[in-house]
Interface confidence: medium
């Protein structure tokens, strides 16, 4: 209630003969601030004077604090909050209450605590769980209801003695609510520390011993088992006997049953102690234990591994991997259940042994196709030797081998037969399943590599095939060696380079682009006149008379060839120049005569020029001259002459007779 | 490396024995089979027989039956000849050889000159 | 026993040269037949196993081909350290019997 000083402290503090005790404390005066402070020890209320009667350990006042015990009492307090208090050292007839006397201006208070001070240190206190499991962890702590400021102490863990390795939390309280000093330690207990002793110890700051607290430790676990086998190695051969007994050395709590398993599986009807085996044999090979329980759980010895030996079993080949394909690698692997495991072996290549090759298994680095077979395989231990058994087979899958095109055609082959080819291989592991041709042509193929081919041409040159199954191998190409009548024929002029003029040295010649075969023979031809059977055809001096229209024919054993017709075209002056007249030579006057100049000419004439009976020009220059009306005076000898890129020609003169009329001759 | 050295050349008088060494290196011996194989002067290659170095087992031709024994230590990786009652057409190069798993020889000794010369 | 038989027992090649040896079989040997060449005074070498397989080392001029009773030992373009005997011999059976031998010899 309010008219109450507030105090919070601990209710009793505990310490021994010589240590110190430390009492923290808080008050709350009701009016003011703190003016006198006195410390009794075992405070009576004196009824008659109103004042505590006790031994004064400690007084301060308005005037100064009063020195006492040469400071072993301390008020370490202050006048408004604070009243914690310190003995050093403490004394055995310390204990007992500790009166706080507490006065302000107006209000006093007399505040009781209990200090318990014994002879000798007291021991701590051991805490442990209700229960405590193998390899389940645990917290042990370790409590004392001691802390001083001035007197360290320190608590240690021992295992039967042994300072325990596991660190321990070490924790204190100073508070106005509690003063302890605790010690927590973390552990998994095994099975082994059933029945052992842990000690708590309290020691000084030199770890000198001050007292300690013991418990043994229950830890509930599992039965422990040891499991012991005659022989003692646990290998026998089929037939022979083995015992195995079963000893249980820790349960907690006791055991209530008994089973024996192999390889896991409980035993059936085997629920005593000891197991008896007779007559063994290699299928009772395996990992024996016992299997007792209790109320936490089964416990299981550790396995007897149980061999029971016996020669090798019928083997069988593992291969990695059939099929194999040609130049990869392979490897054998050979099984047989034997007991000691196989220490040699012996291979077969179908039927036939392999040497060198004792191993479980054989790698052959780079498979060839007659690797191919049946690989068997013998293992042998110390018992014996087993049977060789079935083996397995390896594929060796390679492309096509040794492929060829074959024409099955008589030879020679000519342009515009019928072809056909075979395409045949040696061996092919899988078989072959389709054929390719090169070059690819709109060609049938009336079965597997077979290849028709229809009216063949003159430049078929050659063919490859390629047998295929899951590769594809190409034969080198065949020369078809097609032969034809010559192609290409035409005539062509050698010399000379430009136009031909008459008087020219002229060759032709007689070209072709090819023949199969090769031998040929030439013909020259004119208006079907043959002119020779050279490859060339020569003018020494060519006249007009030699244009016309040449062909050249070229044979070979297949057939001839002609060229197209080749114009030869000779340019040459005008010649054969002579004038005619129209309509005569003799015309009477006041008639039209007209004289043309005719020639022969290559090219044509380009340009005329007349003449009189006295060489004189006329101004005349085309190839007609026309007079009209024709006179007397026009009679005389004419002649023309005619121009052509190549030259000039000139006519004989011919004469032209001109008459009187008569008209004429009438009037005279 | 895989070598097979051979002991040195021997004279016999006829009638007499004469054992050939080969000793293996660079190999595991009792892995592959040891083919004895002799070349008399100026004739072909002669097969006389083999032996498995792993189980001591033999094979002779049967030229030789009676007269060829071959035997082998593997404690030293050695393999051994010996060709007993000599005769003059007995002269030759005597080979020791390895044959490998596919079954051809590999590996040649040196070869051991046998010369029976009364 | 099988017989091994070699021709020819001799041929005069020159350099560059292709040249075929054979080697026939009195039964089938499926293909365990080896080629070996020998030079005077020297150890013979493999060159082919199993009728068609290079041995390592071996030069790819030298080829083998064939099964059963036929086989070829062809030695593309003649070099010359290739002037030696060359042999075969069937692993097919024991005994093992080698060819009589091929003395290749300079022209």
């Known amino acids: 209630d309010s008219s109450k000083w507030v105090f919070e402290h601990p209710e009793t503090l505990y310490a021994w003969e010589g240590a110190c005790v430390w009492i923290p404390c808080t008050y709350r005066a009701l009016d003011g601030d703190l003016e006198s402070f006195i410390l009794f020890h075992n405070p009576e209320y004196n009824k008659n004077t109103s004042k505590f009667d006790g031994t004064r350990l400690y007084e301060s006042t308005k005037d100064g604090k009063v020195p006492s015990e040469q400071k072993r009492v301390q008020f370490l307090g202050d006048k408004n909050k604070n009243c914690t208090l310190s003995i050093h050292p403490v004394h055995l007839n310390d204990s007992g209450q500790l009166g706080l006397r507490m006065e302000s201006k107006t209000e006093k208070w007399m505040e009781r605590i209990h200090l318990n001070v014994s002879e000798r240190p007291f021991p701590p206190h051991i805490q442990l769980p209700p229960e405590i499991q193998e390899s389940q962890e645990v917290t042990l702590t370790c409590l004392l209801n001691f802390s001083c400021y001035g007197y360290p102490i320190q608590l240690q863990w021992l295992l039967e003695g042994v300072p325990m390795r596991q660190a321990a939390v070490t924790s204190t309280s100073l508070t106005i609510k509690s003063v302890f000093t605790r010690s927590e330690l973390k552990f998994s207990p095994q099975w082994s520390h059933h029945g052992k002793i842990v000690t708590c110890q309290l020691q000084d700051a030199d770890g000198k011993f001050l007292s300690n607290d013991t418990v043994q430790l229950n830890v509930k676990h599992t039965p422990k088992l040891e499991i012991k086998v005659t022989p003692s190695d646990a290998i026998v051969r089929e037939g022979d006997s083995v015992t195995m007994t079963c000893e249980v050395s820790s349960s907690n709590p006791e055991y209530t049953t008994v089973s024996w398993l192999k390889d896991g599986t409980s035993l059936k009807k085997q629920n005593t102690f000891t197991l008896n085996l007779r007559e063994v044999t290699k299928d009772q090979s395996g990992k024996y234990c016992c299997q007792v329980s209790n109320d936490v759980g089964p416990g299981r010895s550790e396995e007897v591994f149980l061999q029971v030996q016996y020669a090798p079993e019928p083997s069988t080949v593992q291969i990695l991997h059939s099929p194999a394909v040609e130049g990869s690698q392979v490897e054998f692997l050979c099984m047989s259940l034997a007991n000691p495991l196989p220490t040699n072996y012996t291979w077969y290549h179908n039927g036939k042994e392999m040497q060198g090759r004792t191993e479980e298994k054989v790698h052959i680095p780079k498979i060839l196709p007659w690797h191919a077979g049946t690989y068997s395989c013998v293992a042998e231990n110390i018992l014996g030797t087993g049977q060789r058994g079935p083996g397995a087979e390896l594929d060796v899958q390679y492309p096509p081998k040794k492929v060829t095109t074959v024409i099955q055609n008589p030879m020679p082959i000519r342009e515009g037969d019928t072809v056909t080819l075979s395409c045949n291989y040696n061996s092919s592991n899988p078989s072959v399943t389709r054929y390719e041709w090169k070059p690819h042509g709109a060609w049938e193929e009336p079965s597997l590599g077979v290849l028709k081919i229809q009216n063949v041409g003159w430049d078929n040159t050659t063919i490859a095939c390629a047998a295929c199954n899951s590769w594809c191998s190409w034969a080198s190409p065949v020369a078809l060696n097609v032969q034809y009548a010559p192609r290409d024929v035409r005539v062509r002029k050698i010399k000379p380079l430009s136009e031909i003029h008459s008087g020219n040295s002229v060759s032709l010649q007689c070209d072709f682009s090819s023949s199969h075969p090769k031998e040929v023979q030439f013909f020259w031809e004119k208006n079907g006149r043959l002119l020779g059977k050279e490859s060339q055809l020569n003018f020494d001096s060519i006249s007009p008379e030699d244009a016309g229209s040449y062909s050249c024919w070229v044979n070979n054993s297949i057939g001839q060839t002609a060229s197209k017709a080749w114009t030869l075209e000779v340019l040459y002056a005008p010649r054969r120049l002579r004038v005619s007249m129209s309509p005569g030579d003799q015309v009477m006057e006041g008639k039209s005569a007209t004289l043309t100049c005719e020639s022969d000419a290559n090219p044509p004439v380009s340009h005329y020029t007349w003449f009189d009976w006295n060489n004189q020009s006329l101004p005349y220059h085309s190839q007609k001259l026309r007079l009209e009306p024709v006179k007397v005076q026009h009679s005389g000898a004419y002649w023309c002459q005619g121009t052509n890129s190549v030259g000039k020609g000139r006519s004989p003169l011919s004469t032209l007779t001109v008459y009187y009329s008569p008209e004429t001759i009438g009037r005279r | 490396q895989v070598q097979l050295v051979q002991s040195g050349a021997e004279v016999k008088k006829p009638g007499a024995s004469v054992k050939v060494s080969c000793k293996a290196s660079g190999y595991t011996f009792t892995g592959y089979y040891i083919h004895w194989v002799r070349q008399a002067p100026g004739q072909g290659l002669e097969w006389m027989g083999w032996?498995?170095?792993?189980?001591?087992?033999?094979n002779y031709a049967q030229k030789f039956q009676g007269r060829v024994t071959m035997t082998r230590d593997t404690s030293i990786g050695t393999a051994y000849m010996e060709l007993s009652r000599l005769r003059s057409d007995d002269t030759a190069i005597y080979y020791c050889?390895?044959?490998?798993?596919?079954?051809?020889?590999?590996?040649w000794g040196q070869g051991t000159l046998v010369t029976v010369s009364s | 026993d099988i017989q091994m038989t070699q021709s020819p027992s001799s041929l005069s090649a020159s350099v560059g040269d292709r040249v075929t040896i054979t080697c026939r079989a009195s039964q089938s040997i499926s293909s365990h037949l080896n080629w070996y060449q020998q030079k005077p005074g020297k150890a013979p070498k493999l060159l082919i196993y199993?009728?068609?397989s290079l041995h390592s080392g071996v030069p790819s001029r030298f080829s083998g081909s064939g099964s059963g009773t036929d086989f070829t030992l062809t030695i593309s373009s003649l070099q010359p350290e290739d002037f030696a005997t060359y042999c075969c011999?069937?692993?097919?059976?024991?005994?093992?019997?080698f060819g009589q031998g091929t003395k290749v010899e300079i022209k």
């Open positions: 011999q069937q692993s097919y059976s024991t005994p093992r019997t």
């Open positions: 032996i498995n170095p792993n189980s001591g087992g033999t």
């Open positions: 199993a009728a068609s």
């Open positions: 050889t390895r044959e490998d798993t596919w079954n051809y020889i590999d590996y």
